[in-house]
């Protein structure tokens, strides 16, 4: 389980001097301190999530380290960089016309990030084009301070969006999960997430990733037909990264799509999830926001079964445990819900076929003057193998034409005394949404399907 | 199928207020879409005079911001535009539409479904 | 508010021909363009959205592209039921505005 060496810093950030990646493109960073470079790595990974206001779990529940602690604490820790891929920012209640206490965190985010421009650290954002929240001027007021700010513009280039939402912050720290820069992602959205820590390796590959995105946000950007092989990757499924982390013997690795935006060695997400699915033996528990076995916003619809037959077969042919955790909000497709039926219409316990649908309803209570809230956003699997934690919902469109990244970590189970493993946490964090009086069977959901808490 | 209806007087006096109505069948308007209001002139422009949302929030164009409402009646499956003080310039064919899809993450919003139109003449 | 301008109002182009309808807007509106068609009888119809998308039942002949402000509507073979009045309209911010319309006839 020894930490591997590091590629060389130059292929996979180009810090030292303004460095052309084709069309002009480079980042203009800093260089980093030697001995920040030669510090060794002591990963650790921390699962962060945020829980919406008044949605009270059981007293003892489990919960992750709070979203919007983490990201200030990461913004705490950067002295040279902060890269943020997202897919929109809307950090202050004004974007969406709202005035409401619960923007706080989210503006203080934004403080922050101003801050950390005022101390030379440099900020560079790769977002959407098409984007939502398309009055927000979070991104004009960074700029004007200096941010780098790069619209990558999906919707020409792939006919998707830049759905990814991470940070790498001096190519030794990162943020992934489900929440884009948005303060209700901060107090009225559940998301979950992981922070890694001091985990230049990892770092510098996801980095990799940012570059994609980066080099195609300069005016007239084509994809190319093959990337240049200072992108490459060589931490994948076949060759995860393979280190320590707080002692516990660990294997990572990113995933990204679509795949035109994935060079040599890159793992594509769909790849990623298929594996981590097909090598499940006992049970595979799912949390993603959207669950359509079709494409999603491109007409005609076309019909997409590829998790779906894994979903199936594993539960068919191997006897998993699937369960299944869809959200269900104001501004759900209510033509999701025929395909969940149908799902969970192959469990048949007499034949050990066991194949469970809920809903999670965050319940909206006094908080209905917030547009597109209150809801699990979530989009994480687990297994008693392998925890994989992802931006990108459950529908073709993610993986054939949207950005996404996702993360894969395995943990020796036993060898701590300390702590569960990373996807013993994660099985427990589902667990307790699952059991919880907010995740609903669908015959507990009224034909409607109008994602009203009932209480 | 969706469909959407618009109803209400051809003919109003300057000064008084206009009142339409939009009626929906085939969805619900607590669902998904802005519930809008377009009017066009004689001569073809169109203009867009405001929407009341899926959730009871209303927009409206800053040129009608002081004359117009949108409110609904969901018992009903309706929706409303008032618009005071009208003047001959206000004539138009009035036509109620649908935006969205407002669903999670779509960064696509068109007016999918229209209403066939209801001219209304402002005269004395 | 953002301005939308069709600058042809009318045209008139042969059965079969190839057809294209041009649209400006005052300012980069991001590819956030709809376009619409309505029939002589007042019936209003999506076609196109976000630039270069076919709405779902719009026939293959109609086809969009554009960036920044220019924009245009393309039908490639033209048949007598596409005599309409055709209208951009954007979506990047509110409100929503349209361009003037172009009528479109058969020679």
């Known amino acids: 389980w020894q930490v591997r060496c590091p590629p060389t810093w130059g292929q996979v950030q180009p810090r030292d001097v303004p460095r052309s990646w084709g069309h002009g493109s480079s980042l203009a960073l800093e260089p980093l301190e030697a001995e920040v470079r030669k510090q060794r790595d002591s990963c650790q990974l921390v699962l962060v999530e945020s829980i919406p206001q008044d949605l009270p779990f059981a007293a003892g529940s489990l919960s992750a380290q709070p979203l919007g602690q983490a990201w200030l604490q990461l913004l705490d820790t950067a002295q040279e960089s902060v890269h943020v891929a997202s897919y929109y920012w809307s950090l202050t209640g004004p974007d969406i016309g709202v005035n409401d206490s619960s923007s706080q965190l989210g503006e203080a985010l934004l403080q922050k990030l101003q801050q950390l421009l005022g101390r030379n650290i440099s900020l560079a954002v790769a977002t959407s084009s098409p984007t939502l929240a398309r009055k927000s001027t979070d991104l004009q007021v960074l700029a004007a301070r200096g941010a780098q700010v790069r619209r990558v513009p999906m919707g020409r280039l792939t006919r998707g969006v830049l759905h990814s939402k991470f940070w790498v912050v001096d190519g030794r720290h990162i943020y992934m999960g489900s929440a884009n820069m948005d303060w209700r992602s901060l107090t009225q959205v559940k998301e979950l997430g992981a922070v890694i820590y001091n985990c230049s390796h990892l770092a510098q590959d996801l980095e990799k990733t940012f570059q994609t995105y980066w080099v195609l946000g300069v005016p007239k950007a084509v994809l190319p037909k093959t990337w240049p092989q200072n992108f490459s990757s060589h931490i994948n499924r076949f060759q995860p990264f393979q280190g320590l982390f707080d002692g516990v013997p660990t294997t990572a690795y990113f995933s990204a799509s679509p795949p035109a935006l994935c060079p040599q060695g890159r793992t594509p997400d769909l790849e990623a999830l298929l594996a981590v699915m097909g090598s499940a033996q006992e049970f595979i528990y799912a949390s993603v926001m959207e669950y359509f076995p079709t494409t999603r916003f491109s007409h005609p619809r076309r019909y997409w079964p590829v998790l779906d037959n894994a979903l199936r077969a594993a539960a068919f042919s191997k006897g998993v445990r699937v369960r299944l955790l869809v959200s269900c909000g104001l501004n759900t497709d209510p033509t999701m819900f025929p395909y969940l039926r149908s799902l969970q219409a192959l469990s048949n316990p007499a034949a050990n076929v066991s194949v469970d649908v809920k809903v999670f309803i965050v319940p909206v209570g006094n908080h209905s003057n917030i547009p597109f809230s209150r809801v699990n956003h979530s989009k994480f699997m687990v297994t008693e193998k392998a925890a994989y934690i992802g931006t990108s919902n459950w529908s073709e469109d993610y993986f054939s034409s949207t950005t996404g990244v996702g993360l894969v970590v395995t943990q020796s189970p036993g060898a701590q005394p300390a702590g569960a493993t990373v996807q013993e946490q994660l099985r427990q964090l589902f667990e307790r949404d699952w059991s919880s009086r907010y995740a609903v069977g669908l015959d507990g959901q009224a034909p409607g399907q109008d994602c009203v808490w009932q209480g | 199928d969706v469909q959407l209806q618009e109803s209400g007087p051809g003919l109003v006096k300057p000064s008084q207020s206009l009142s339409l109505t939009c009626s929906v069948t085939?969805?619900?308007?607590?669902?998904?879409y802005y519930w809008t209001w377009i009017r066009q002139f004689p001569g073809n422009k169109l203009e867009w005079m405001g929407y009341i949302s899926y959730d009871g929030s209303n927009n409206y164009n800053p040129s009608l911001k002081n004359r117009i409402s949108i409110t609904r009646d969901t018992s009903k499956n309706q929706f409303f535009l008032k618009l005071n003080s009208v003047t001959t310039e206000d004539t138009a064919t009035y036509n109620c539409?649908?935006?969205?899809?407002?669903?999670?993450?779509?960064?696509?919003?068109?007016?999918?479904?229209w209403g066939a139109g209801t001219t209304v003449t402002v005269s004395s | 508010d953002i301005q939308m301008t069709q600058t042809t109002s009318s045209l008139s182009a042969s059965l079969g021909d190839r057809v294209t309808i041009s649209c400006r807007a005052s300012?980069?509106?991001?590819?956030?363009l709809n376009w619409y068609q309505q029939k002589p009888d007042g019936t209003v119809k999506l076609l196109i959205y976000?630039?270069?998308r076919l709405h779902s039942g719009v026939p293959s002949r109609f086809s969009g592209s554009g960036s920044g402000t220019d924009y245009s509507l393309t039908i490639s073979n033209l048949e007598q039921e596409d005599v309409a009045t055709y209208f951009c309209q954007q979506f990047n911010t509110l409100p929503r505005t349209f361009g003037g319309g172009t009528k479109l006839e058969i020679k």
């Open positions: 300012q980069d509106i991001d590819n956030y």
């Open positions: 085939g969805y619900s308007i607590t669902s998904h």
């Open positions: 539409a649908r935006e969205g899809p407002l669903y999670y993450g779509n960064p696509y919003w068109y007016f999918d479904v």
């Open positions: 976000y630039t270069s």
